[in-house]
Amino acid sequence: EEAQGDKIIDGAPCARGSHPWQVALLSGNQLHCGGVLVNERWVLTAAHCKMNEYTVHLGSDTLGDRRAQRIKASKSFRHPGYSTQTHVNDLMLVKLNSQARLSSMVKKVRLPSRCEPPGTTCTVSGWGTTTSPDVTFPSDLMCVDVKLISPQDCTKVYKDLLENSMLCAGIPDSKKNACNGDSGGPLVCRGTLQGLVSWGTFPCGQPNDPGVYTQVCKFTKWINDTMKKHR
């Protein structure tokens, strides 16, 4: 089992039902990571969230809501190029043991047809800790708006830690960021999934240290091919 999921700081509760594709990956009853519903059978998350078995929470912004769907999943497929050391290609597909029931609160995320440019305003969401290094886990889904940062500007911060398929987002001089428990969750820009929470500086919320995301637009072929292959 990998490190517990990563990382919302300086955010606010999401508007109810505004993120119907958002899921939580639970280990037993405990939050492990975030994720997104790609279709009735598949959840997309970060590769570093891998476990042997998952309980997937869908359909409610509140963890522990009895009206939520809870579906077990025992098969997951990491991107073959994932590195535990560098977190390059940090994405994974999780196959649900039974189909999710789509509704107004459970919807498929829109995968990107293009990569959004730097400066685009996006929303990152999750049930991860709202304080760091001391942890405070909310029961309600939290959201924060951040802007995409160019690879050139992000490399100035993270230098050799940054790889090609990584996407950076943040707000200058702000603490706004994802944090422990948010990993694998969505960064949504103009209605499409552009990023999955991957990593950032610990403690979370260091000003001018952006959050780092897996750039989903670079992986749509792998996502579709993998779902087809393991139908």
């Epitope: 990998e2 490190a3 911060v157 990593w199 500086t201 610990f202 001018n208 240290d209």
Partner: antibody, heavy 122, light 107 residues
Framework: QVQLQESGPGLVKPSQTLSLTCTVS??????????WNWIRQHPGKGLEWIGS???????YYNPSLKSRVTISVDTSKNQFSLKLSSVTAADTAVYYC??????????????WGQGTLVTVSS | DIQMTQSPSSLSASVGDRVTITCQAS??????LNWYQQKPGKAPKLLIY???NLETGVPSRFSGSGSGTDFTFTISSLQPEDIATYYC?????????FGGGTKVEIK
Amino acid sequence: QVQLQESGPGLVKPSQTLSLTCTVSGGSISSGGYSWNWIRQHPGKGLEWIGSIYRSGSTYYNPSLKSRVTISVDTSKNQFSLKLSSVTAADTAVYYCARAKALTTHRYVDYWGQGTLVTVSS
Amino acid sequence: DIQMTQSPSSLSASVGDRVTITCQASQDIANYLNWYQQKPGKAPKLLIYDASNLETGVPSRFSGSGSGTDFTFTISSLQPEDIATYYCQQARDLPFTFGGGTKVEIK
């Protein structure tokens, strides 16, 4: 290859302030994703984390020492410093400066200075 | 603070022996557990990070396992150059804390 070098007096009188500086070469102290730490080791004993500083200037201290510790950074000189006030003989130790990878996913000390022995005695 | 209990505090083994050191955390630290080797008069050196990942350049006879509260460090075949004190360290929460150390000697 990142290298760290501690400097400062090896002897400090009780009640005075211990001051050490760490000079970093082969890497920038203003790189994100890393913390710059002070760790000490009492003679023949284990390791104790004192505190850390980030490129942003944010600091985190061990609660057991917090009231006496100040860590600061000078990015222009690629240095960070430790001040420990009101020292007693119990502060006699080898003091290490160290770089840690400080990510939400990985956290570990990857580079250490060679350590400097500071003795508190009158 | 998270307490780290390491055992044994010292051990003596022959060259070629398998050596095992355990480390227990006072609360769940997921896999935020690192192992360091310290030789007399030297600074510690990172061997294993995230409980089981071998640091670049470290011989493969060193390994680590565990998650949650219980962790194990193993030297599969003890070599003379492995005489040192080994420390576990939790990195789940601040302050980072270390185990008391295990001194490894050759019989």
